[in-house]
């Protein structure tokens, strides 16, 4: 089989027939050096998954539940292409599983015990697997058989397709539990009717159900959604209030050597020639000899799944939690109000050492998880492998786009009421050597630049955002002759000045000596013309405050700031000569961990925060010899956010807009992946 062949896996005679037709029609429209199709027939989807893992086939399209199976070891498959529905302008690749209730009913998600429930059908995604999976650990023991536990949890249900003889309570609201439209409460519309008629208190359906059944907004306003954080929201706010976000139908391939680019090339060309309304002879999204053969008949096209996205990220934390609970059936010993330990994400070796020290001192309240880059840490928090970390504003933006929330802000100024007063921010500045007297904001082209890291506020988003407004393109590596911007592509001129050795060169962590505020300033001292840092960086590393050999003899007076009006000022005049005021670094977590992270961190800072006077003999949370490990070293306390508890509110609309404008220059694979889940 030639290398440019995609071996498609079919699960029935009818699918195999359509696959052969697909193969033949593609041959007729694609040049001989283009991608081609071969067909492999297997008895089931699970057999297809195994065949792909064993390199006997390359691709198959799966529902969400099977994407989860495909991801599990030893299969290790990943999503590569998603079907979309709706229009090309507003493509829908996901649906949202929601819990709908009547507006005046007054209970929350954690008060469902004893209520009456309406389900689309036993074993169905939005109507059963997701809600029951998420409620699994609240079900009364024994939890097997599951139907019995569910029957004992709710006071009555309609779960079409359930066994009404063994579990009569599951059919209490719809006598007989019929498994077809003959049962008026079957399926999405049926489950909603069960709620509407007053038979049930809650209906587990998908987000579109209520819109399909109630055309009138006034009627829809009589209903609300239950959110996982035990609040309610209007039905049109399903993107912020759902049980899970579920991919509709997805092509999977091997994670390693999986031909994902070839599969996309094939399907992209296929949709051009044989997509919706393209061809009479062969239609990709039509099944004359059956239903949903190879692809869903209702699909309108394909979208490439971003390469950074593995199955866990694609399926989402809530969905994976629900399915894992149902499959594995494991729960904590007994549900308690106690917070579990917070798993802190530490960046590379240096942060891990400090985190381990914190963990020991916290007596089990803090555990440590490692990752090599900030984005890897954010991904681990998203999928539950980690719980929290403190981030620069630029990464608070990415984390926010990925569904995480800020919980506490670092404060840098001593005040009586530190923990209750989040600060407005710190200043992003451009520092130069006083001796380079001709250098101004207006003649930086061709100079050597030093950045904290790509994607960070003072070191990248602010200066590059301002620069983009001037030069109107993203080729920053051409604007500066060379530089060090950790996180850039290794062959970029913006890695040329970096000092890390071997694989650590230009890495966005402390293994790169020019990483972070102190690193970027060191880069200026040793090699560069301009450093983009925070206003405290120069005083913190001069006048003997940093004992490292490169810094111990530095004098603040030897450096100046570049102002946006083309003038220069002494370092202490940052308030009148800065590029922007940046939002303070903030701790982020998943919404479900918000309360516990908040509680434990407030306890931890009372034990190990700025009130500790001697850091030589005691653990200090906010100290690491100018290396800013886990937190910035100038942190005085972690402050409550009050109502600024979403990433947009925390960062402010101008910063969000500024970073949004820079998105066209973004190299963030994680941001691309998260934007795919929530455009």
């Amino acid at each position: 089989v030639p290398d440019k062949t995609v071996r498609w896996c079919a699960v029935s005679e009818h699918e195999a027939t359509k696959c052969q037709s697909f193969r033949d029609h593609m041959k007729s429209v694609i040049p001989s050096d283009g991608p081609s199709v071969a067909c492999v027939k297997k008895a089931s989807y699970l057999d297809c998954i195994r065949a792909i893992a064993a390199n006997e086939a390359d691709a198959v399209t799966l529902d969400a539940g099977l994407v989860y199976d495909a991801y599990l070891a030893p299969n290790n498959l990943k999503p590569v292409v998603a079907e979309f529905y709706g229009s090309k302008e507003d493509p829908q690749t996901f649906y949202y599983a929601v819990a709908v209730v009547k507006k005046d009913s007054g209970f929350q998600m954690n008060q469902l015990r004893g209520k009456k429930s309406c389900h689309t059908g036993l074993g169905r995604s939005a109507g059963w697997n997701i809600p029951i999976g998420l409620l699994y650990c609240d079900l009364p023991e024994p939890r097997k058989p599951l139907e019995k536990a569910v029957a004992n949890f709710f006071s009555g249900s309609c779960a079409p397709c359930a066994d009404g003889t063994d579990f009569p309570q599951l059919c209490q609201l719809c006598p007989g539990c019929g498994c077809s439209t003959l049962n008026q409460y079957f399926g999405y519309s049926g489950a909603f009717k069960c709620l509407k008629d007053g038979a049930g208190d809650v209906a587990f359906v998908k987000h579109s159900t209520i819109f399909e059944n109630l055309a009138n907004k006034a009627d829809r306003d009589q209903y609300e959604l239950l959110c996982l954080d035990n609040t309610r929201k209007p039905v049109d706010e399903y993107k912020d209030c759902h049980l899970a976000q579920v991919p509709s139908h997805t092509v999977v391939a091997r994670s390693m050597g999986g031909k994902e680019d070839l599969i996309w090339e094939l399907l992209n060309q296929a949709q051009e020639h044989f997509g919706k309304d393209k061809s009479k002879e062969f239609q990709l999204f039509s099944s004359p000899h059956g239903k949903d053969l190879l692809f869903k008949d209702s699909a309108h096209g394909f979208l490439k799944v971003p390469p950074r996205m593995d199955a866990k990220m694609y399926l989402g934390y809530e969905y994976v939690t629900a399915i894992r609970n149902l499959r594995e059936g494991t729960c904590p010993e007994a549900p308690t109000d106690e917070c579990k330990p917070v798993k802190w994400c530490a960046l590379s070796h240096h942060e891990r050492l400090k985190c381990d020290e914190w963990s020991v001192n916290s007596v089990g309240k803090i555990e440590c998880v490692s990752a090599e880059t900030t984005e890897d840490c954010i991904a681990k928090i998203m999928n539950g492998e980690a719980d929290a970390m403190s981030l620069d504003g630029g990464f608070v933006y990415i984390a926010g786009k990925c569904g995480l929330v800020p919980v506490l802000a670092e404060n840098y100024n001593k005040s009586d009421n530190c923990e209750d007063t989040p600060e407005a921010g710190y200043f992003a500045i451009a520092v130069v050597k006083k001796s380079a007297s001709d250098l101004t904001w207006d003649n930086l082209k061709g100079k050597k630049s030093c950045h904290t890291a790509v994607g960070r506020t003072a070191g990248w988003n602010i200066p590059m955002g301002l620069l983009y407004n001037k030069i109107n393109h993203c080729r920053f590596d051409e604007f500066f002759s060379e530089g060090c911007a950790p996180g850039s592509k290794k062959d970029s001129s913006l890695c040329k000045l970096c000092m890390g050795s071997g694989l650590n060169l230009c890495e966005p962590n402390n293994k790169e000596g020019y990483y972070g505020y102190t690193g970027a300033f060191r880069c200026l001292v040793e090699k560069g013309d301009v450093a983009f840092v925070k206003h405290q960086t120069v005083p913190q590393n001069t006048g003997g405050k940093n004992p490292d050999p490169w810094a111990k003899n530095l004098n603040e007076k030897d450096y100046e700031l570049l102002c946006l009006d083309g003038t220069r000022k002494p370092v202490e005049e940052y308030a009148n000569c800065h590029l922007a005021r940046a939002p303070n670094h903030a701790v982020v977590t998943r919404k479900d961990k918000e309360a516990c992270v908040h509680k434990i961190l407030r306890q931890q800072q009372h034990l190990f925060g700025s009130n500790v006077t001697d850091c030589s003999g005691n653990f200090c949370l906010f100290r690491s010899e100018t290396k800013d490990l886990l937190f910035r070293d100038d942190t005085v306390c972690l402050a409550k956010l009050h109502d600024r508890n979403t990433y947009e509110k925390y960062l402010g609309e101008e910063y969000v807009k500024a970073v949004g404008n820079l998105r066209k220059c973004s190299t963030s694979s994680l941001l691309e992946a998260c934007t795919f889940r929530r455009p």
Epitope: A424, G425, A575, N576, A580, R581, G652, E654, Y655, A658
Partner: nanobody, 125 residues
């Protein structure tokens, strides 16, 4: 949310004076720069003057230096533009602008994220 509301515009003879006010409401404690811009019919919007609310330091376009003065009343969340010795070429719609992100020291309108609706100033000869 941030709102900026201008007032004080009107018609005046050349050589006369006007005082414009800009009242800010919403999350205003964190402004890094506030300023006044103007737009004459058929022309680009241009910067007139800015003030740093934290330090009180001011910045003026060359065309208004010595004639216009920007000031603030932090207690009232208000910024003023005192315009003296007005000329016919000062006729324009005057806009109050603010940013919580960028510094003063530049009259580039792209740095300002919040804008008022404007107040009209007409100077006749």
């Amino acid at each position: 949310d941030v709102q900026l509301v201008e007032s004080g515009g009107g018609s005046v003879q050349a050589g006369g004076s006007l005082r414009l006010s800009c009242a800010a409401s919403g999350y205003t404690r964190s402004f890094t720069c506030m300023g006044w811009f103007r737009q004459a019919p058929g022309k680009e919007r241009e910067g007139v003057a800015t003030i740093n609310p934290g330090t009180g330091s001011t910045y003026y376009a060359d065309s208004v230096k010595g004639r216009f003065s920007i000031s603030q009343d932090n207690a009232k969340n208000t910024v003023y533009l005192q315009m003296n010795t007005l000329k016919p070429e000062d006729t324009a719609m005057y806009y109050c602008a603010a940013t919580q992100l960028f510094g003063c020291g530049s009259l580039a309108k792209s740095l300002f994220g919040y804008w008022g609706q404007g107040t009209l100033v007409t100077v006749s000869s």
